[in-house]
């Protein structure tokens, strides 16, 4: 059974992941930066089901495309800290959260998503899991 300390650690990792995803979304949704419409050509795959930590496998598989689109977006008006570093940090958190005991084949929904829809989906996932832990 999960201990209170492991639950607390999980919660903190989810909060860190949530903040990273929100930071990216805030940069993209910055209306001072409509240049970023070019990012809408990129297609992201959404999980058919995302209710448990193991479903983060679906996010992990989309991190490479996410890095590519963020590299395209980098400009004077949209500047994240080193993109590679950011994605690497997200990857580390995702790997720890989903665990490596069971390898899940991610099931994707039929409908694809833009980067905005994709980030919103995973932000909602983080918020939902955090609320069950608190």
């Amino acid at each position: 059974a999960p201990t209170s300390s492991s639950t607390k650690k999980t919660q903190l990792q989810l909060e860190h992941l949530l903040l990273d995803l929100q930071m990216i979304l805030n940069g993209i949704n910055n209306y001072k930066n409509p240049k970023l419409t070019r990012m809408l050509t990129f297609k992201f795959y959404m999980p058919k089901k995302a209710t448990e930590l193991r479903h983060l496998q679906c996010l992990e598989e989309e991190l490479k495309p996410l890095e590519e689109v963020l590299n395209l977006a980098q400009s004077k008006s949209f500047h994240l800290r080193d993109t590679k570093d950011l994605i690497s940090n997200i990857n580390v958190i995702v790997l720890e959260l989903k665990g490596s005991e069971t390898t899940l084949m991610c099931e994707y929904a039929d409908e694809t998503a833009t980067i905005v829809e994709f980030l919103n989906r995973w932000i909602t996932f983080c918020q939902s899991i955090i609320s069950t832990l608190t």
Epitope: P34, K35, T37, L40, T41, S75, T112, T114
Partner: antibody
């Protein structure tokens, strides 16, 4: 009404220079990418390049890089396509188009009426 | 350079279904957009982001995408749908855009 109005038809000789224009109205011209598209007679559409009038960042098709220059003057809501030395093969219809955002994603939702360029000796 | 390949022509009887395909290596990760161009006119956006229809575009126009292939479907084709259709997308880098080779749709 959102629209793009292009300059009139041009007849030029090989080796001459040319600058055609595309004036936007009815929206914030600064905040939308503008693309240029070539269509030779009886042929398909060819993407030439895009410009973001807000800071004049441009992207060119490898096929048109070095052949044309795309520019914009946001103070008068106008984008330009220019040639320093025209060739007979530049004879075509040229369209400017606005890349959307919002409801049309990256789709080109507003098009100019087209400018016919004829290059002949 | 990146290419999007379409069939040169598609013929359909009025009321029947026309399907136009667009093939490109980057399409699993990049959205396709479809334009209709009638003779002597500027192109019009009929589908964006693979399957979304702009307001004012009839419901008979739909789009889908699977793997390296995007498809524009005209269900119950009308005589006024006779036009050239072009897909449009970007290469894998997202920096360069390209139109498909174009498909002439004839409604016989």
């Amino acid at each position: 009404e959102v629209q793009l109005v292009q300059s009139g038809a041009e007849v030029k000789k090989p080796g001459e220079s040319l600058k055609i224009s595309c004036k936007g109205s009815g929206y914030n011209f600064t905040n939308y990418w503008i693309g240029w598209v070539r269509q030779m007679s009886g042929k398909g559409l060819e993407w030439m390049g895009i410009i973001y009038p807000g800071d004049s960042e441009t992207r060119y098709s490898p096929s048109f890089q070095g052949q044309v220059t795309i520019s914009a003057d946001k103070s008068i809501s106008t984008a330009y396509l220019q040639w320093s030395s025209l060739k007979a093969s530049d004879t075509a219809m040229y369209y400017c188009a606005r890349h959307g955002g919002g409801w049309s994603g990256w789709g080109m939702d507003v098009w100019g009426q087209g400018t016919t360029v004829t290059v002949s000796s | 350079s990146y290419e999007l390949t379409q069939p040169p022509s598609v013929s359909v009887s009025p009321g029947q279904t026309a399907r136009i395909t667009c093939s490109g290596d980057a399409l699993p990760r990049k959205y396709a957009y479809w334009y209709q161009q009638k003779s002597g006119q500027a192109p019009v956006l009929v589908i964006y982001e693979d399957s979304k229809r702009p307001s004012g575009i009839p419901e008979r126009f739909s789009g889908s995408s699977s793997g390296t292939m995007a498809t524009l479907t005209i269900s119950g084709a009308q005589v006024e749908d006779e036009a050239d259709y072009y897909c449009y997308s970007t290469d894998s880098s997202g920096n360069h855009y390209v139109f498909g080779t174009g498909t002439k749709v004839t409604v016989l």
